[in-house]
């Protein structure tokens, strides 16, 4: 006799055996595309992906025969649960193909997108290394603005229609899988059902994120105020002492990690530099050395070496002009014991820590390789992200850097070096939390249908100002898709994992430091060489997804839930110091200020009162005409008054704060140069000169088309009748 459970086991054994092979073929084809973006490799990836999808769909269909309520064995139950999830395979064939095409196209646009110099179209930059270099190192406000705006204009705008379609198809897929929407589907990764005392709902994740964010806010607000004061020194007259931070000044293309602001914000600059980039360069480190050092760290806590195949097959440097690759760092578990990292490593401290992060993924992958195919994953997505981060917390400590020769042997730790270190850590770790929370909150709202697509950008920047305290340096209308200018958005990765991982990593760090018998503050703990800490971690890693994450967390840290306390404890000395630094500064931000506010002109339009029943609707076409009319006025003014032929176009007239009762602000930039804002006084003169032409275009007059602060016209306000 054979029970249903035994039959399910037989079914799953057969599945595991066949899945291994097909998944490997698909992964390999995907790796080939990611390391060498060609049309042929896209085709191969799609073909292998189609085979894998078809197999998965068939197996998922067969798995429905096994009722979960009759399965007692948790391992069998979890595998069936995973397999009964249909994922994208619930879509019709044509929709499934379309979704695949959209995802591939978005990925290709992102990784091959170029920005060219308007004065020399042959001179072009990719994101990596070109634009990222500017955003990491440049202190030129206008150069940064050019890179920031060009990336979003070139790449974001191309992604916009694709992203709109992606949202519709992913929602359809999620609903067919019995989720409310795609955001809900993503949150399903944290769901735990039917395990007494360890259950966790998708709604609970939202609650936990919201209430932990409230607890983090005071620390972030003080970091924000301190950074703002330092940016005011670096960019005099560009920053408001009570306003948001301009989005293009924050250390990378997205303001995601503020790490590169360290040199501008270092509290005690006379102390030896704990950003060891220069030491790495001086000592001739290369990508191989960086990863070998990361490996040494893992091995020192008793975790395994990387495989021979890892070193042979990984792509650890940018292939440059040889071929185009996806340069965003990723860790790959292709199956069959084949583990790889793809990263365009640069010799910087930042990439030294990123190497630990990526190798953390591989350690997790290797640890659960013995689990059945369907349970080879992190207990939840945040766990996977946390592993390498735990190692980075130790690897970044002055103690550890000293031990590997990147800080001088006579480096002395004191209160000042401690604050320098904690500030550097906070720029990376605390600075990113509101960014992460706000991005995912926006996507959740989009998937839920709470933000109509004609308000995506409007809401994005409203939320960015309110939650993150960051403002757009130039306004963006609904032709842009700023979220998709980030890898994770255009490449279909959930993002809340980077929030949850940050909380978990400090919970884990606290527990592992106890295991390593560390004494003293948490921020000084370096777990390297502690096999006790390594063993404690490994016991969790090897479980993969075979146990609920709430249970796995409890096994390591003694609590079932994410908790922000350890993170706040870690940064406590810095928080105290920041409060003292900020005692004469405004902490928080006004969302009203923008970098372009001073040069903006407000317009009010009264169609109803001017035209009565003949009033037309103010829409995108009318706005296009308005911007064209102002561009015309600018051309006329520069030609007639300044004897300069400057070809202003409608795209140089930048509109913000459009209100439905028709008011908005606008300012004008020089053609092909977003950072060259034409002074408001010049624009006012141009408007006055062409006022009647602009009025006529809209069948309005000086009162119903009102430019606030501009005298109606150069002529008398009321023409006497001609006799």
């Amino acid at each position: 006799q054979s029970t249903i459970e035994e039959q399910a086991k037989t079914f799953l054994d057969k599945f595991n055996h066949e899945a291994e092979d097909l998944f490997y073929q698909s992964s390999l084809a995907s790796w080939n595309y990611n390391t060498n973006i060609t049309e042929e490799n896209v085709q191969n990836m799609n073909n292998a992906g189609d085979k894998w999808s078809a197999f998965l769909k068939e197996q998922s269909t067969l798995a429905q025969m096994y009722p979960l309520q009759e399965i007692q064995n948790l391992t069998v139950k979890l595998q069936l649960q995973a397999l009964q999830q249909n994922g994208s395979s619930v879509l019709s064939e044509d929709k499934s193909k379309r979704l695949n095409t959209i995802l591939n196209t978005m990925s290709t646009i992102y990784s091959t997108g170029k920005v060219c110099n308007p004065d020399n179209p042959q001179e072009c930059l990719l994101l990596e290394p070109g634009l990222n270099e500017i955003m990491a190192n440049s202190l030129d406000y206008n150069e940064r603005l050019w890179a920031w705006e060009s990336w979003r204009s070139e790449v974001g705008k191309q992604l916009r229609p694709l992203y709109e379609e992606y949202v519709v198809l992913k929602n359809e897929m999620a609903r067919a899988n019995h989720y409310e929407d795609y955001g809900d589907y993503w949150r399903g990764d944290y769901e735990v059902n039917g395990v007494d005392g360890y259950d966790y709902s998708r709604g609970q994740l939202i609650e936990d994120v919201e209430h932990t964010f409230e607890e983090i806010k005071p620390l972030y607000e003080h970091l924000h105020a301190y950074v703002r004061a330092k940016l005011m020194n670096a960019y005099p007259s560009y920053i408001s002492p009570i306003g948001c931070l301009p989005a293009h000044l924050l250390g990378d293309m997205w303001g995601r990690f503020w790490t590169n602001l360290y040199s501008l914000t270092v509290p005690f600059g006379q102390k030896p530099n704990i950003d060891v980039t220069d030491a790495m360069v001086d000592q001739a480190w290369d990508a191989q050395r960086i990863f070998k050092e990361a490996e040494k760290f893992f091995v020192s806590v008793g975790l395994p070496n990387m495989t021979q195949g890892f070193w042979e097959n990984s792509m650890l440097t940018d292939p440059g002009n040889v071929q185009k690759a996806v340069c965003h760092p990723t860790a790959w578990d292709l199956g069959k014991g084949d583990f790889r990292i793809l990263m365009c490593t640069k010799v910087t401290m930042d990439d030294f820590l990123t190497a630990h992060h990526e190798m953390g993924h591989i350690q997790y992958d290797m640890a659960y390789a013995a689990q059945p195919f369907l349970l080879r994953n992190g207990a939840n997505e945040g766990f996977h992200e946390a592993v390498g981060e735990i190692m980075s917390l130790s690897a970044a400590t002055p103690k550890h850097l000293k031990s590997i020769g990147l800080l001088s042997p006579d480096f002395q730790e004191d209160n000042e070096t401690e604050i320098n270190f904690l500030l550097k850590q906070a720029l990376t770790i605390v600075g990113t939390l509101p960014f992460t929370y706000m991005l995912e909150k926006w996507r959740w709202m989009v998937f839920k249908g709470e933000i109509p697509k004609d308000q995506w950008m409007k809401k994005w920047w409203e939320m960015k100002r309110e939650i993150v305290g960051v403002v757009e340096p130039v306004p963006h209308d609904e032709t842009y898709c700023d979220p998709a200018s980030l890898f994770h958005v255009s490449n279909d990765y959930s993002f809340i994992r980077y929030y949850t991982r940050t909380l978990y990593q400090f919970q884990f760090q606290e527990a592992l430091c106890q295991a390593a018998k560390h004494e003293g503050p948490l921020h000084k703990c370096d777990i390297s060489n502690s096999t006790e800490a390594g063993q404690k971690l490994f016991n969790m890693l090897r479980l993969g997804k075979s146990e609920p994450w709430t249970l796995a967390l409890e096994n390591v840290v003694g609590a079932k839930n994410m908790n922000v306390r350890p993170l706040l404890n870690y940064f406590e000395p810095l928080f105290t110091w920041l409060k003292d630094q900020n005692k004469n500064s405004f902490v928080g931000w006004s969302t009203d200020w923008s970098p372009y506010a001073d040069q903006s002109i407000k317009v009010r339009i009264s169609l109803k009162s001017a035209l009565g029943d003949k009033a037309y609707e103010w829409n995108d076409n009318e706005m296009y005409l308005f911007r064209s009319s102002v561009a015309y006025a600018m051309r006329q003014y520069f030609l007639k008054v300044k004897n300069q032929m400057i070809l202003f176009g409608e795209e140089d007239v930048r509109v913000a704060n459009l209100k439905p009762r028709i008011s908005f602000n606008f300012f004008v930039t020089a053609p092909k140069n977003v950072s060259d804002i034409i002074p408001r006084t010049e624009v006012e003169k141009a408007i006055r000169m062409s006022r009647s032409r602009i009025n006529d275009a809209f069948r309005l007059n000086d009162n119903s088309l009102e430019f606030l602060g501009i005298q109606p016209t150069l002529g008398p306000p009321n023409q006497p009748p001609v006799s």
Epitope: Q1, S2, T3, I4, Q7, A8, T10, F11, K14, F15, L62, M65, Y66, P67, Q69, E70
Partner: nanobody, 116 residues
Amino acid sequence: EVQLVESGGGLVQPGGSLRLSCAASGRTFSDARMGWFRQAPGKEREFVGAVSWSGGTTVYADSVKGRFTISADNSKNTAYLQMNSLKPEDTAVYYCATTEDPYPRWGQGTLVTVSS
């Protein structure tokens, strides 16, 4: 090994009923489950429902809940799919499979056409 033969298909008007049978020979497990699947023209094969020879839990796809009923007659080694309130979108080739054979070799199936 188990051999399965489906029968009972045909043309039926919307709102009508039909009963399909799946005869199993070579059965060895009293505790196995019988599943019904269907494949509409140009679509992927989809799960309809499943029942255990020994009773137990019966599961259905959302699209057929409340209209279709699956049963099994242990003594006759036959499983049934009673389909009521049929709709044009139920038009498909219907197949049966068993958990005794984790990787079914799909038979000919039986064609059900719902049309006025």
